[in-house]
């Protein structure tokens, strides 16, 4: 069952999934000047059996002008965002080491991919939030959102994360929230 809405937006924060539940779809979007190849699938789909999950279909982009052939590539190191360690990143690293049953990992980039990935999430999906660069967590309650089905409708739970650009003294020294990492999350993560 697909989630009706996007995960909630949190002011000055971005969200990221650690892994994607089977049934999740990722649109095959191309950057400006490129389009999906004619025979190409419009989306990738996380599918699996009892032992293994993976993305079905491959996204491929071709130049809108020329009829050049395309290949899937892994980006060069400078194209890959360096990930600093935060509470959320450690969750992600853990998930990278131990594959979650019934989940797919982040699909690798494809050549001339759009900057923004558009996912269609399914019920049971969890996404994690952190403050963007230049902001810190004034309050970090549960900083995740789960797509749940209630009374026949889907609903994302509300993350309890408040990000601020201010620097105010804490009442409890030593319990300030850690500064969000500058490159902790790509801002391109969205869903539809």
């Amino acid at each position: 069952e697909l989630c009706d809405d996007d995960p909630p937006k949190i002011t000055h924060a971005t969200f990221k999934a650690v892994a994607y539940k089977e049934g999740t779809m990722l649109n095959c979007e191309c950057k400006r000047g490129f389009r999906r190849i004619k025979s190409g699938s419009p989306y990738m789909l996380c599918t699996g059996n009892s032992s293994h999950s993976s993305w079905d279909n491959q996204c491929q982009c071709t130049s809108s002008a020329a009829r050049n052939t395309t290949k899937q590539v892994t980006p060069q190191p400078e194209e890959q965002k360096e990930r600093k360690t935060t509470e959320m990143q450690s969750q992600m690293q853990l998930a990278d080491q131990v594959s979650l049953p019934g989940h797919c990992r982040e699909p690798p980039p494809w050549e001339n991919e759009a900057t923004e990935r558009i996912y269609h999430f399914v019920v049971g999906q969890t996404v994690y939030y952190q403050c963007v660069q230049g902001y810190r967590a004034l309050h970090r309650g549960p900083a995740e959102s789960v797509c749940k089905m209630t009374h026949g409708k889907t609903r994302w739970t509300q993350p309890q994360l408040i990000c601020t650009g201010e620097t105010e003294p804490s009442q409890f020294p030593g319990e300030e929230e850690p500064q969000a990492s500058p490159d902790g999350l790509p801002e391109s993560e969205t869903s539809r």
Partner: antibody, heavy 115, light 107 residues
Framework: QVQLQQSGAELVRPGVSVKISCKGS????????MHWVKQSHAKSLEWIGV????????SYNQKFKGKATMTVDKSSSTAYMELARLTSEDSAIYYC????????WGQGTTVTVSS | DIQMTQSPASLSASVGETVTITCRAS??????LEWYQQKQGKSPQLLVY???TLAEGVPSRFSGSGSGTQFSLKINSLQPEDFGTYYC?????????FGGGTKLEIK
């Protein structure tokens, strides 16, 4: 069920301070930040500030800096707001409200400043 | 600071009617907007959050829409318990600010 129980009405003299409380129950207190809101006839609803119930970190509306001081006592699941140097302008109902979306509010504490 | 302007300031309507209350932000507030209902002598209650998500237990006759600077709250088939004052509030950066309120009265 979620409840925010505020302290009772206060009748105070101008120039003094008052400290009002908001006790959370029916949920994990430190999961939700606590906001304070002023309601007066003159200005409708005004956001005073927010405090992290976990860290004690605060953010104030500039207008209330020096007027309001928010604190929290995790052991008793209680948030406090002290209002200093009271004037008739501070006569209002003060509410606490929890979380990012103010999904639950206290019943309000009426503060009357009168000589 | 972002100023929130609600309109109308008051309106009279009959049970069964549909009404719409609007809220305009002086700057882009994206979808960081809540709607509250307040009855006389009571605390405000959350109706809609993030511009369009209905709070738990709120009847489906209420709906929120809009983003950016223009938002609205629609109440279909008004019920006697819907009368009271409605406030919008943004939470896109501090200070959070509220609209002046819309008083909905029985005609």
């Amino acid at each position: 069920q979620v409840q925010l129980q505020q302290s009772g009405a206060e009748l105070v003299r101008p120039g003094v301070s008052v400290k009002i409380s908001c006790k959370g129950s029916g949920y994990t207190f430190t999961d939700y930040a606590m906001h304070w809101v002023k309601q007066s006839h003159a200005k409708s609803l005004e956001w005073i500030g927010v405090i992290s119930t976990y860290s004690g970190d605060v953010s104030y509306n500039q207008k209330f800096k020096g007027k309001a001081t928010m604190t929290v006592d995790k052991s008793s699941s209680t948030a406090y707001m002290e209002l200093a140097r009271l004037t008739s302008e501070d006569s209002a109902i003060y509410y606490c409200a929890r979380g990012v979306t103010f999904d639950s509010w206290g019943q309000g504490t009426t503060v009357t400043v009168s000589s | 600071d972002i100023q929130m302007t609600q309109s109308p300031a008051s309106l009279s309507a009959s049970v069964g009617e549909t009404v719409t209350i609007t809220c305009r932000a002086s700057e882009n507030s994206y979808s960081y907007l809540e709607w509250y209902q307040q009855k006389q002598g009571k605390s405000p209650q959350l109706l809609v959050y993030n511009a369009k998500t209905l709070a738990e237990g709120v009847p489906s006759r209420f709906s929120g829409s809009g983003s950016g600077t223009q938002f609205s709250l629609k109440i279909n088939s008004l019920q006697p318990e819907d009368f009271g004052t409605y406030y919008c509030q943004h939470h896109y950066g501090t200070p959070y600010t509220f609209g002046g309120g819309t008083k909905l009265e029985i005609k």
